[in-house]
Interface confidence: low
């Protein structure tokens, strides 16, 4: 079976004009997934990103996340790239409210 992930991108403010953007994938199966941040379509170096472990979420599916820190006002330049079971999707940083997207393939 394949269960596509729910992808949720959120922002949280940090000091000095920076924000942390977090891309969360949840409720997916199997556990193998790729999440990475891109700036202007180019993948960020791994030393500028942090990943959470892929963990069971209690429903027979899995969850994980990737985060990076960016300058406030540059949110539109960043997207979260997700790849799961041969499918892929790109998810923008929300402007204003949290963006939650159910992947549709």
């Amino acid at each position: 079976r394949t269960v596509p992930p729910m992808v949720n991108v959120t922002c949280s403010e940090v000091s000095e004009g920076n924000i942390t953007v977090t891309c969360r994938a949840s409720s997916f199966y199997p556990r193998n997934i790729t999440l990475t941040w891109r700036q202007d379509g180019v993948s960020l170096s791994h030393n500028t990103q942090q990943w959470g472990d892929v963990l069971p979420d209690g429903n027979g599916t899995y969850q994980t996340w990737v985060a990076t820190r960016i300058r406030q006002g540059e949110e539109q330049r960043f997207t979260c790239y997700m790849e799961h079971s041969g499918n892929h999707g790109t998810h923008p940083v929300p402007s204003g409210k949290v963006l939650a997207l159910q992947s549709q393939w």
Epitope: N32, T34, N47, H84, G86, N87, H88
Partner: antibody, heavy 119, light 108 residues
């Protein structure tokens, strides 16, 4: 059956451009990414770069000024171009498939092709 | 650059014995991004274990992986003749995505 096959000239002159193609079968490059790796004779493995399923690339910074990886999904091929080669670029060049969610690991490899840089 | 140091450089053992191969990273590597490959003479490398401890389908369960942070281990519980080869660890945690220099497992 998953297969990858590297092809290209076995001999390249110094300062010229090394061009290799990886032809794949048993899967589609629209659903799997690809890596290029090289191995100088008698030495270890060195990652050159990769191409994602949607065509974006990541490169080893050591090569970034002279490397290009591209894909032609209609031919099920992805390619490596390495410019301004020197004798230090003599190596066996491998293409490999990026496994699904295997955290960029390479789950299938071509058999490799030896490229010698010499005048 | 994260440097992966494998030890020992060469390991001489007999079939039936247990092999323990070490991979030490110069800085911390997420367990998700540490992989092991096997390479036999004249052949391409083959993925054995991904994300530290996950065995690739078709790889015998005498192979196992463990570790975290900077210290990772590949263990072969009972060596078979076909296991004698060079083993590489590989990290895709931080660019450039490096390999260890390899451990050669040879027949004693």
């Amino acid at each position: 059956q998953v297969q990858l096959q590297e092809s290209g000239p076995g001999l390249v002159k110094p300062s010229e451009t090394l061009s290799l193609t990886c032809t794949v079968s048993g899967f589609s490059l629209t659903t799997y990414g690809g890596h290029w790796i090289r191995q100088p004779p008698g030495k270890g493995l060195e990652w050159i770069g990769m191409i994602w399923t949607d065509g974006w690339t990541d490169y080893n910074a050591a090569f970034i000024s002279r490397v290009t990886i591209s894909v032609d999904t209609s031919k099920n091929q992805f390619s490596l171009k390495l410019s301004s080669v020197t004798a230090a670029d003599t190596a066996v060049y491998y293409c490999a498939r990026k496994g699904h969610g295997y955290y960029y690991a390479m789950d299938y490899w071509g058999q490799g092709t030896l490229v010698t840089v010499s005048s | 650059e994260i440097v992966l140091t494998q030890s020992p450089g060469t390991l001489s053992l007999s079939p039936g014995e247990r092999a323990t191969l070490s991979c030490t990273a110069s800085s911390s590597v997420s367990s998700s991004y540490l992989h092991w490959y096997q390479q036999k003479p004249g052949q391409a490398p083959r993925l054995l274990i991904y994300s530290t401890s996950n065995l690739i389908s078709g790889i015998p369960d005498r192979f196992s992986g463990s570790g975290s942070g900077t210290d990772f281990t590949l263990t072969i519980s009972r060596l078979e003749p076909e296991d004698f080869a060079v083993y590489y660890c590989h990290q895709y945690h931080r660019s450039p995505f490096t390999f260890g220099q390899g451990t050669k497992l040879e027949i004693k």
